[in-house]
């Protein structure tokens, strides 16, 4: 299914901070992803293509972000309890046509060990 | 090998919606989009819409969009086009044909196979 | 919505070389728009030949190619056979929807 729960390792804990990982199919040419938590957009990223296959991206919601040609990561910092809850993948590709959104999520737990800067 | 299958002939009231099928085999049907597509006499083709089985989303020409409802069946791997309230202008052939576009597997792009259409005819 | 212009008609003999063209009313015809190709043939038989600008579909001889020339899609069938005479129609992706052409009929004589 590429609609649904990510059937893969959504999160990514290190230094206090998570890696959100949005996985595409690697056929993708031209795409936006959106980091959803809850209903809220938190970050996005878009790649096209323009004449002579130059490839711009554009965040309108910018996070620290990484692209490779197959994944978009995000990264978030600063963990504290508030940042538990479901975070999803919000993908539309524009290219290989046809027009198709897809939304793939999971829940992000927060344990002690996870935080930023515990009080020892 | 692959085959979209589709009933020769329907005839439909004015006004009674109808529901075409095309029934696929040969491959993986949820892994691939199906069009519609529709030829009037002596017309070339229209393209309706296309839906992909995995999830069912659905794009359509806007000017189908109040006229036909794309659908499938996973469990029969079967795709299905409702047309509702058609009117003369609705009878034509209409065709499934898939887009070999896989999220998963290698990609030509094109519109491979083609079913043999059905041929729609609204009359009293 | 895109308008898809084809020849309406083409003659031409058995073994001669013989293009067909696409033109798009948006503009140039590019890479993005994976243009297709269709044959239709008495009874209602359509075969995907190709796909993605130049990909050609499996069993579809070698002598169909496709190919962008100028800001046109262009399909050639380089040594047409009487068993090509058919009526060929391109089919251009504009993002979420398919716009055809509306056919040559090609006439192998």
């Known amino acids: 299914e590429i609609n649904g729960s990510a059937n893969y390792e959504m999160f990514i804990f290190h230094n206090g901070g998570v890696q959100i990982l949005c996985k595409y199919p690697d056929i993708v040419q031209q795409f936006k992803m959106q980091l959803l938590k809850g209903g809220q957009i938190l970050c996005d990223l878009t790649k096209t293509k323009g004449s002579g296959n130059t490839v711009s991206i554009k965040s309108l919601k910018f996070c620290h972000s990484q692209l490779s040609n197959n994944s978009v990561s995000f990264f978030l910092y600063n963990l504290d309890h508030s940042h538990a809850n479901y975070y999803f993948c919000n993908l539309s590709i524009f290219d290989p046509p046809p027009f198709k959104v897809t939304l793939t999520g999971g829940y992000l737990h927060i344990y002690e060990s996870q935080l930023c800067c515990q009080l020892k | 090998q692959v085959q979209l299958q589709q009933p020769g002939a329907e005839l439909v009231r004015p006004g009674a919606s109808v529901k075409l099928s095309c029934k696929a085999s040969g491959y993986s049907f949820t892994s691939y989009w199906i069009n519609w597509v529709k030829q009037r006499p002596g017309q070339g083709l229209e393209w309706i819409g296309n839906i992909y089985p995995s999830d069912s989303y659905t794009n359509y020409n806007q000017m189908f969009k109040d006229k036909a409802t794309l659908t499938v069946d996973k469990s029969s791997n079967t795709a299905y086009m409702q047309l509702t309230s058609p009117t003369s202008e609705d009878s034509a052939v209409y065709y499934c044909?898939?887009?070999?576009?896989?999220?998963?597997?290698?990609?030509?792009?094109?519109?491979?196979?083609w079913g043999q259409g059905t041929t729609l005819t609204v009359s009293s | 919505q895109a308008v898809v212009t084809q020849e309406s008609a083409l003659t031409t003999s058995p073994g001669e070389t013989v293009t067909l063209t696409c033109r798009s009313s948006?503009?140039?015809?590019?890479?993005?728009?994976?243009a297709n190709w269709v044959q239709e043939k008495p009874d209602h038989l359509f075969t995907g030949l190709i796909g993605g600008t130049n990909n050609r579909a499996p069993g579809v001889p070698a002598r169909f190619s496709g190919s962008l020339i100028g800001d046109k899609a262009a399909l050639t069938i380089t040594g047409a056979q009487t068993e090509d005479e058919a009526i060929y129609f391109c089919?251009?992706?504009?993002?979420?929807?398919?716009?055809f052409g509306g056919g040559t009929k090609l006439t192998v004589l």
């Open positions: 089919a251009l992706w504009y993002n979420n929807h398919l716009v």
């Open positions: 948006t503009g140039a015809v590019t890479t993005s728009n994976y």
């Open positions: 044909t898939r887009w070999n576009l896989s999220y998963y597997f290698d990609n030509n792009y094109y519109l491979d196979y």
